[in-house]
């Protein structure tokens, strides 16, 4: 806490500018009006204040806004955001996606801090759900964001938001997360035609049940082996040789190279040898 001292003559700040970097902490406290600081927050980032000086500026804003900063100030916090605690952020009401982007930009390239996590949480709760534009923004800054949500958190993601998901956003998801995401993706893309639908749903198929794989096998999708290997073993096992052949199309020859690996290995063991022989790949059940 900085002591209350009178501002020296001629030092009263008329605007937030470079001259303030030469002010001692007590001078900043005494000579910078909090309301002036709030209206000129956008200038703070262009000035190389020390961490100690930023502490004073934060203190002034805290005094001016004890119930939490208004969004007009939050949007221009810049590096001062790094000084905020999760407790500070819980007082905020952030509704603008531009504000969220501005603050995420400050933390760009770093792991997710408790401050950023709290900010995102406040923002999403304020919107009522993790909508498409928000998810788009979050995965741009944090590609692993979606796969860092628990299955319970994912269950509240609306199907419409799935349009924002890129294949790489699912790279670190586990089977339980895909179990939740797949039905949402199926719903989101249901009005697309066969080939377009398959392109979009492909990344989510690790959560697909047998009946959906059977349906896909009737659509000439030519699933590649990399996708096939990520399918749930329990979903693949009931498929017939003919269904797998249709599902993979020209890629069916790749089964030979994967015959010792799941789910191919377990699937082979479930098939009649006569049926496997029709593939002409030398697969042994």
């Amino acid at each position: 806490e900085v002591e209350k001292t009178a501002c020296p003559s001629g030092k009263k700040a008329r605007e937030i500018d470079e001259s303030l970097i030469f002010y001692k902490k007590w001078e900043l406290e005494a000579c910078v009006d909090a309301a002036l600081l709030a209206t000129q927050m956008d200038r703070v980032n262009a000035i190389p204040f020390t961490y100690e000086q930023l502490d004073v500026l934060k203190h002034k804003l805290d005094e001016l806004y004890p119930q939490g900063y208004p969004e007009s100030v939050i949007q221009h916090l810049g590096y001062l955001f790094l000084k905020m605690s999760p407790e500070d952020i819980r007082k905020w009401n952030v509704t603008s996606l531009e504000t969220l982007k501005a603050l995420l930009e400050v933390n760009k390239g770093h792991e997710m801090s408790p401050q950023v996590a709290t900010l995102i949480d406040r923002f999403v709760k304020g919107r009522g759900q993790l909508d498409k534009d928000t998810l788009d923004t979050l995965t741009a800054f944090y590609p692993g964001y979606l796969c860092s949500l628990s299955p319970e958190e994912l269950s509240s993601v609306p199907p419409s938001s799935i349009w924002a998901v890129r294949p790489q956003d699912l790279d670190t998801c586990d089977p339980r997360q895909l179990d939740v995401l797949y039905p949402k993706a199926r719903l989101a893309f249901q009005n697309m035609n066969g080939s377009e639908y398959f392109v979009k749903i492909q990344s989510f198929l690790g959560g697909a049940p047998t009946e959906d794989l059977k349906a896909l096998s009737q659509q000439n999708v030519s699933m590649d082996l990399a996708t096939f290997m990520k399918l749930r073993t329990d979903a693949v096992l009931p498929l017939t040789v003919a269904e797998v052949q249709k599902l993979l199309g020209p890629h069916v020859e790749g089964l030979k190279a994967e015959e010792r690996h799941r789910p191919v290995r377990d699937w082979i063991l479930r098939q009649r040898q006569d049926d496997l022989d029709t593939l002409g790949l030398g697969l042994q059940g």
Epitope: P143, G144, T172
Partner: nanobody, 116 residues
Framework: QMQLVESGGGSVQAGGSLRLSCTVS????????LRWYRQALGKEREFISA???????SYSDSVKGRFTISRDNAKNTAYLQMNSLKSEDTAMYYC??????????WGQGTQVTVSS
């Protein structure tokens, strides 16, 4: 750079218990997810369990009801309590950590051998 170290593996009789630990260092992502996988000889790695940043847990069907995952955030450690072990649980057990950046980090693994 994140580092993961697993420990707690060993040999045990069928029906016995073991507790594996996975300690994470060099990483402070608030959205850290810790997962356990295992790989038996000649087979591929399979997902066993996960614990998410909100404390929610998930399990594969093969271990549900027998294994319990937990974490101590203060120690940056995840645990896998394995009860009623079976011979088919014999494998190398690996810890995997992923954060909001979308990069996966793996430990070196710890061997679990269950004899009947």
């Amino acid at each position: 750079q994140m580092q993961l170290v697993e420990s707690g593996g060993g040999s045990v009789q069928a029906g016995g218990s073991l507790r594996l630990s996975c300690t994470v260092s060099g990483y402070t992502d608030y959205r850290l997810v810790l997962r356990w996988y295992r790989q038996a000889l000649g087979k591929e790695r399979e997902f066993i369990s996960a614990i998410y940043s909100d404390g929610v847990t998930s399990y594969s069907d093969s271990v549900k009801g027998r294994f319990t995952i937990s974490r101590d955030n203060a120690k940056n450690t995840a645990y896998l309590q394995m009860n009623s072990l079976k011979s088919e649980d014999t494998a190398m057990y690996y810890c995997k950590a992923t954060g909001s950046g979308g990069v996966a980090y793996w430990g070196q693994g710890t061997q679990v051998t269950v004899s009947s």
